[in-house]
Interface confidence: low
């Protein structure tokens, strides 16, 4: 006998990433005979579900399930019919549903039940809809990034597996309602809740991870809006010349703005709020999101959360990528250093509404929020996580790797379908009849 290749039959897996602002469906594929290889699973296709995230259907759970139908119909086309029954289908919900579960557990249960009901109607191997913990979201994002970049294990030209010397990459994810930081660390965590130990391909990894609920982009924008209403009566992060009617019920309905909620307020009242293009006041407003006053550990990131010093290279994805990409591509600003990132944020915050619209034609949605978004990303990385210039040099802002979206979804599927074994891979034996 000798080592042989079997016919390249493909297997498929589907993950619905139910985020706070929207849901994305990812279909993955891999050769059936190479399930335990690294870097073998790749993205086959994807689909963005129209409308808001499933947590936005708190008052209409059936609407949540119905919103998924278009993408599920696409999945029926994208996965060969003979593979439908053997294709695992997962739905994982993140911080939007974690927030809903805090404020209205009955509604979150109803949404998951409605979604489950619809997903079971399809011919795939449905394996559950659940809310991921912040820790899971962080770790699976880290697994995805390192799997795609082949940092766990590699197949050498001499025909054997080896562990690459470059080490693993840290992962930073900025979602709509939470943000996660995850990286390999040598020292044990002082806070056990922040440590995860993984055994992948015979290697042991000690990983630090933390998820900050209410520090996702959308919730940060809501919190800044609440602060602006409370302290200024104008919004220093919005461009001068931009004005909008703010419904107080919108601002204060999130648990993330609960602390800023006035004792008595009319939820149906509308307040006119204008921008002032003030980068310094905006920076102060963003600074107010972070607390550095008390730390029960030897060192903390912010809000009393333990974090070892950031080490090694990092990949920053989701809204980290979109924010930096806007600065780089739409605004034409350099962001290679922390200093440049800060200067770019100040530059955007200095623009009037007319200047911003002229500079970024055709992009109206969320345009007024890029100043706050950029200021937040810069402060989160430098002050929050403690990246200095040297460490920041090792951060890459990326949306995809190996034609696959970077996020928790792939890592989640790899874990649940046992596509990353704990043991080192061995060669399969077969008989060559040729």
């Amino acid at each position: 006998t000798r080592d042989v290749r079997e016919p390249p039959a493909l297997k498929y897996g589907i993950v619905l990433d139910a985020g706070s602002s929207h849901t994305s469906m990812f279909i993955y594929k891999w050769p059936a005979d190479k399930e335990n290889d690294t870097g073998i699973v790749g993205q086959h296709s994807s689909c963005d579900v129209p409308g808001g995230g499933i947590s936005s259907y708190a008052d209409n759970p059936s609407g949540a399930s119905q919103s998924l139908v278009g993408c599920l119909e696409q999945a029926l086309q994208d996965v060969p019919k003979e593979r439908h029954a053997g294709t695992p289908l997962y739905l994982g919900a993140t911080a939007g549903m974690r927030l809903l579960n805090l404020t209205n557990p009955e509604a979150s249960t109803s949404v998951l039940m409605a979604v489950t009901h619809t997903l079971t109607q399809y011919p795939f191997d449905f394996r559950g809809a659940r809310i991921l913990s912040g820790q899971e979201e962080g770790v699976f994002g880290w697994v995805t990034a390192n799997y795609l970049l082949e940092n766990f294990i590699k197949y050498g030209w001499v025909g054997r597996w080896f562990r690459p010397r470059k080490g693993t990459l840290g992962a930073m994810d900025l979602g709509g309602a939470s943000t996660q930081i995850t990286f390999e660390t040598t020292s044990p965590a002082e806070d056990r809740a922040s440590e995860v130990q993984l055994h992948l391909y015979g290697q042991h990894y000690r990983v630090y991870t933390h998820s900050f609920l209410c520090y996702g982009r959308d919730q940060v924008l809501q919190r800044l809006l609440a602060s602006a209403l409370q302290t200024h009566g104008f919004h220093p992060c919005w461009p001068r010349g931009f004005s909008t009617q703010v419904l107080l019920g919108d601002v204060y309905q999130s648990p993330c703005t609960m602390a800023q909620r006035p004792q008595n307020f009319n939820s149906s009242a509308r307040v006119s709020l204008s921008g002032s293009s003030d980068p310094h006041l905006c920076r102060d407003l963003v600074s107010g999101l972070f607390s550095f006053s008390s730390c029960p550990f030897s060192r903390c990131s912010f809000n009393g959360v333990f974090q070892p010093p950031v080490a090694g290279n990092f990949v920053a994805f989701s809204a980290f990528f979109y924010t930096v990409d806007f600065l780089r591509t739409s605004m034409g600003l350099p962001v290679a250093t922390l200093q440049q990132l800060e200067a770019a944020a100040v530059n955007v915050c200095n623009q009037t509404w007319a200047q911003l619209q002229a500079r970024v034609p055709g992009q109206r949605a969320r345009l007024a929020d890029y100043c706050a978004g950029a200021m937040f990303v810069q402060q989160l990385l430098s002050r929050g996580y403690g990246f200095d210039e040297r460490a920041f040099g090792g951060v890459i802002f990326q949306k995809k790797a190996a034609d696959t979206a970077v996020g928790w979804a792939l890592g989640y599927m790899l874990n649940l379908t046992n596509l990353i074994p704990a043991d080192p891979p061995g060669l399969r034996k077969g008989t060559d009849f040729s």
Epitope: S56, D59, E106, M113, A114, L247, D250, S267
Partner: antibody
Framework: QVQLVQSGAEVVKPGASVKISCKAS????????MDWVKQAPGQRLEWIGD????????TYNQQFKGKATITVDTSASTAYMELSSLRSEDTAVYYC??????????????????WGQGTLVTVSS | EIVLTQSPATLSASPGERITLSCSAS?????IHWYQQKPGQAPRLLIY???NLASGIPARFSGSGSGTFYTLTISSVEPEDAAVYYC?????????FGGGTKLEIK
């Protein structure tokens, strides 16, 4: 203007089935879910279920599963509800109601903004 | 399922009087809608999402509340307000209605 016109009253025998209709006009039929609500004499309103005309997906209150079947004919902008194995306790006025909604910071909130005039179904031997 | 209890079951008021109808939920709900139903007619949306007046509804109607307790207030009752008023929740499957409060005008 937006209108929902339901079919006329029905008198049916126990064990039989009945199919009532709800014709919509004045709006794009596939843009809104259609719900059905039961009002038995002296009882509170009960939500039966709904249908999304765009995707032809219906959702039911557990209590009405097997009793009610909701369908649509999008070409006729009409929703239907069939009630089977009728018993005296199914005697009620049945309403179709359009599910209106408004967006509230990215969250859809729903309510019944337009109602049909109701169809009285009497189950009697 | 969430049970909505309305009180009082019947209320008699004179024109010009200010009245309050209440709706109590068996567990916390996000929002309540109110409907008005006159004899022989279909229900009509009065207030949506606790406090928003539906189109064409006079300003004498107002709603408030949160959690498990909600109210509908008519600041100055008119003869045409004689009807049954229902509260309705969309926070948890299945959507449910209250038993109704019948408003009679003296």
């Amino acid at each position: 203007q937006v209108q929902l016109v339901q079919s006329g009253a029905e008198v049916v025998k126990p064990g039989a089935s009945v199919k009532i209709s709800c014709k919509a006009s004045g709006y794009t039929f596939t843009d809104y879910n259609m719900d059905w609500v039961k009002q038995a004499p002296g009882q509170r309103l009960e939500w039966i279920g709904d249908i999304n005309p765009k995707y032809d997906i219906s959702t039911y209150n557990q209590q009405f599963k097997g009793k009610a079947t909701i369908t649509v004919d999008t070409s006729a902008s009409t929703a239907y509800m069939e009630l089977s194995s009728l018993r005296s306790e199914d005697t009620a006025v049945y309403y179709c109601a359009r599910r209106g909604f408004f967006l509230y910071y990215g969250i859809n909130y729903y309510y019944f903004d337009v109602w049909g005039q109701g169809t009285l179904v009497t189950v009697s031997s | 399922e969430i049970v909505l209890t309305q009180s009082p079951a019947t209320l008699s008021a004179s024109p010009g009087e200010r009245i309050t109808l209440s709706c109590s939920a068996s567990s916390s709900v996000s929002y309540i809608h109110w409907y008005q139903q006159k004899p022989g007619q279909a229900p009509r949306l009065l207030i949506y999402s606790t406090s928003n007046l539906a189109s064409g509804i006079p300003a004498r109607f107002s709603g408030s509340g949160s959690g498990t307790f909600y109210t509908l207030t008519i600041s100055s009752v008119e003869p045409e307000d004689a009807a049954v008023y229902y509260c309705h929740q969309w926070s948890s499957y299945p959507w449910t209605f209250g038993g109704g409060t019948k408003l009679e005008i003296k």
